[in-house]
Amino acid sequence: MRTEAQVPALQPPEPGLEGAMGHRTLVLPWVLLTLCVTAGTPEVWVQVRMEATELSSFTIRCGFLGSGSISLVTVSWGGPNGAGGTTLAVLHPERGIRQWAPARQARWETQSSISLILEGSGASSPCANTTFCCKFASFPEGSWEACGSLPPSSDPGLSAPPTPAPILRADLAGILGVSGVLLFGCVYLLHLLRRHKHRPAPRLQPSRTSPQAPRARAWAPSQASQAALHVPYATINTSCRPATLDTAHPHGGPSWWASLPTHAAHRPQGPAAWASTPIPARGSFVSVENGLYAQAGERPPHTGPGLTLFPDPRGPRAMEGPLGVR
């Protein structure tokens, strides 16, 4: 899934403007401190449990650890969604849940986690080394996907305590750039604070109109861009393929859940590519490739786009595509 993210540049203070240092020292550190505190990389966790009563029945739980609004979740097996995986369920925070066999019951557990029970009979039933993937589309983080499977040695009905699991995928274009800006900001803040310790506290001066006065600008997504980013659901994928990384996410649920080993599958995608393909969203389509929605319309209360996520699942039909699965 790709989405467009514009990251306004944080402008460093202009050199040689010591006279305005007092003003800058008061404003910029707070701006940067806010960014540093609130900045955090979202994470997706996946846990799988094989039912003791039905050896071919699985329960998958997935969650999103981030501050954004989830607009869509897709669960699949057989590989990541969009890469040969079979979609099992699509969950939209406002449009509801859709599921296909062998999924038996998908549901929202909280506003940021879902669970899925899989049937255990039939040719399409999962096997013990099946890999399950959950993709969360959210605003403003973008699309994040993680995959996991039962640990090879786990007994039915039991599971290892959750262990840290890497995030498998972060498709939001520019997310590294944002991280870089924030990292720079935090380092710069520390630098400012160190310098501040070695100089007398500046006095507040009347505001100046001089064109030379430095302006500290904090970045925050514009309302327009927020409305445009809206994600509606989560998808879970599964497949009978051995997992490669024997790690799982730390923020796990109850200890009886087995954390799935995750597969690192980050695919860097250039901004140009994701801006070209329309992505359907709830009620309207968007020009974001692979599942994020661009919405120019209204944002639903807890969601970004379609359920409103990136340029929306509810967005101008100019970016059209139905809301479905990414």
Epitope: W100, T110, S124, A281, L323
Partner: antibody, heavy 114, light 113 residues
Framework: EVQLQQSGPELVKPGASVKISCKAS????????MNWVKQSHGKSLEWIGD????????NYNQKFKGKATLTVDKSSNTAYMELRSLTSEDSAVYYC???????WGTGTTVTVSS | DIVMTQSPSSLSVSAGEKVTMSCKSS????????????LAWYQQKPGQPPKLLIY???TRESGVPDRFTGSGSGTDFTLTISSVQAEDLAVYYC?????????FGGGTKLEIK
């Protein structure tokens, strides 16, 4: 622009079968599920079932199990619904609707008459 | 199956008037996990397919005029048109988005005097 173009009207005899199509354009076909909805003349809407292109197991409304069969052809971005053992009760307009009923097809009128 | 019941079945109003129509479900449409009510409203004008108006009980679809407002929770829902326009002549359907099979109400036909 996202569009769902359905096949033309059908006049069929009782007991026969008919297969109607819904060609999608303007979005990635495999990313979204497709619903089929029946609307009898002057009546409300009835959901028949849904299918997602990368899963071969459609969902059906119990009422239409045995009556409707949903399939997709990913190579042509087309969804199909076959109706069999037709009776006059099956005369209606049938719509395809993508995703969460976000985009609707043009509708296909099926008339069952001897 | 969840049964959706709409009332009135039809109503006739003059342009500029406020209109309210009701939709009741036989079971709660509230999703306990995320506290959302999974109900949608559609507008079907003569000779056209239905068009999504509102989802999640109250979220307007992109491009839908703000004179359309959805409200309600649990089993009782309402669609309000604050100032009816001539182009609002249509049948309005509510839909259960909560659980399979997805079911629609019988519709409320809005006529303009």
């Amino acid at each position: 622009e996202v569009q769902l173009q359905q096949s033309g009207p059908e006049l069929v005899k009782p007991g026969a079968s008919v297969k109607i199509s819904c060609k999608a354009s303007g979005y990635t076909f495999t990313d979204y599920f497709m619903n089929w909805v029946k609307q009898s003349h002057g009546k409300s809407l009835e959901w028949i079932g849904d299918i997602i292109p990368n899963n071969d197991s459609p969902n059906y409304n119990q009422k239409f199990k045995g009556k409707a069969t949903l399939t997709v052809d990913k190579s042509s971005n087309t969804a199909y619904m076959e109706l069999r053992s037709l009776t006059s009760e099956d005369s209606a307009v049938y719509y395809c609707a993508s995703g969460y009923f976000d985009v609707w097809g043009t509708g296909t009128t099926v008339t069952v008459s001897s | 199956d969840i049964v959706m019941t709409q009332s009135p079945s039809s109503l006739s109003v003059s342009a500029g008037e406020k209109v309210t129509m009701s939709c009741k479900s036989s079971q709660s449409l509230l999703n306990s996990g995320n506290q959302k009510n999974f109900l949608a409203w559609y507008q079907q004008k003569p000779g056209q397919p239905p068009k999504l108006l509102i989802y999640g009980t109250s979220t307007r679809e992109s491009g839908v005029p703000d004179r359309f407002t959805g409200s309600g929770s649990g089993t009782d829902f309402t669609l309000t048109i604050s100032s009816v326009q001539a182009e609002d002549l249509a049948v309005y359907y509510c839909q259960n988005d909560h659980s399979y099979p997805w079911t629609f109400g019988g519709g409320t036909k809005l006529e303009i005097k």
